[in-house]
């Protein structure tokens, strides 16, 4: 179904991974497709097998090296192709000249931990994962706290407009269970987007001392 709407979107995690999603309305679920990466100034080529993630979309990760190796720079251009098998031959379905540092999506922050918790406050820290040293301090974060009886979508976003890998949550309710998430985004890149949200960190505030509050 070539006339069905199709879309090919990829992001670079800033180190050694390009993640791609190919979607095509009306395509058969068992279609065999691959993504081919052909850099303009590197000796390597890379391929990954697109695997179904929903009725009409497929995804795969181009693993360019070990997780923390710096495989691409801002001057690289990688020609990406979607190739699908039709009978005995391969057919090109999409093609793009991809500038990795214009299309960034970092890995979700990791190692969330409670540094200190009180009745009304909680200090939380985290680490960024597989982020290029090229960014230096040019990163921003968004965080959200899940309160009892609310959903993540209702949680107000807190913005940290600098590379700050901690936050002090205030005005919390004593003896209450909360969850916390954070995500990261480089300032660089026209098509750069937020990382996925981190795994939620559950914590509980301390109960109020008897006779206080």
């Amino acid at each position: 179904a070539v006339n069905g709407t199709s879309r090919f979107t990829c992001f670079y995690n800033s180190r050694a991974n390009i993640s791609c999603v190919w979607s095509q309305d009306g395509a058969l679920q068992d279609t065999s497709c691959q993504v081919h990466a052909w850099p303009d100034r590197r000796r390597w080529n890379q391929t990954c097998e697109l695997l179904p993630v929903s009725q009409a979309s497929w995804a795969c990760n181009l693993i360019l090296g070990t997780p923390d190796s710096q495989k691409l720079t801002a001057v690289d251009i990688v020609t990406l192709r979607v190739m699908c098998r039709e009978g005995v031959r391969w057919r090109m379905m999409a093609i793009q000249d991809f500038k990795p540092f214009e299309n960034l999506r970092l890995m979700a922050p990791i190692s969330l931990q409670v540094v200190h918790v009180e009745t009304h406050r909680c200090n939380i820290s985290w680490k960024i994962s597989q982020a290029s040293h090229y960014f230096e301090r040019h990163l921003e974060f968004e965080a959200r706290t899940l309160s009892p009886g609310h959903t993540w979508e209702e949680a107000p976003l807190m913005t940290l407009k600098q590379k700050q890998e901690w936050i002090c949550l205030e005005t919390l309710t004593p003896d209450t269970q909360y969850e916390f998430q954070v995500r990261v985004k480089p300032l660089q890149g026209e098509f750069t987007t937020w990382s996925p949200w981190s795994q939620p960190l559950a914590f509980r505030t301390k109960p109020a001392a008897l006779g206080k509050d």
Epitope: N3, S6, F8, I77, T79, A94, I95, D97, N103
Partner: nanobody
Framework: EVQLVESGGGLVQAGGSLRLSCAAS????????MGWFRQAPGKEREFVAA????????MYAESVEGRFTISRENAKNMVYLQMNSLKPEDTAIYYC??????????????????WGQGTQVTVSS
């Protein structure tokens, strides 16, 4: 925003050649993937060829592979379609199309946001 104007169409004998041109205006042309589509009388518009913004990558419909060549000249904001060994079934209106910046070139019309008015190509037998 990209504006596109096609030219170079005309009447040609089967086996002959034509070169279509697409002039683009807009600052983002040099980083935009481009394509050619065609629509024959009574048929749906179909994909012909596409080219990436550096010109490194090209993609063709099976019906034109080996006969048509897509190219571009970013310094002049131009895309070309060299059509050789033309056949009567190549008769159609040919459209130049531009993907939105940062988007891949695909075979479906929906992947392109900007279109020219088209140029008529007629191949007589």
């Amino acid at each position: 925003e990209v504006q596109l104007v096609e030219s170079g169409g005309g009447l040609v004998q089967a086996g002959g050649s034509l070169r279509l041109s697409c002039a683009a205006s807009g600052r983002t042309f040099s980083t935009t993937e481009m394509g050619w589509f065609r629509q024959a009388p009574g048929k749906e518009r179909e994909f012909v060829a596409a080219i990436t913004w550096t010109g490194r990558g090209t993609m063709y419909a099976e019906s034109v592979e080996g006969r048509f060549t897509i190219s571009r000249e970013n310094a002049k904001n131009m895309v070309y379609l060299q059509m050789n060994s033309l056949k009567p079934e190549d008769t159609a209106i040919y459209y130049c199309a531009a993907a939105r910046r940062g988007r891949a070139a695909v075979r479906s019309e929906g992947g392109y946001d900007f279109w020219g008015q088209g140029t008529q190509v007629t191949v007589s037998s």
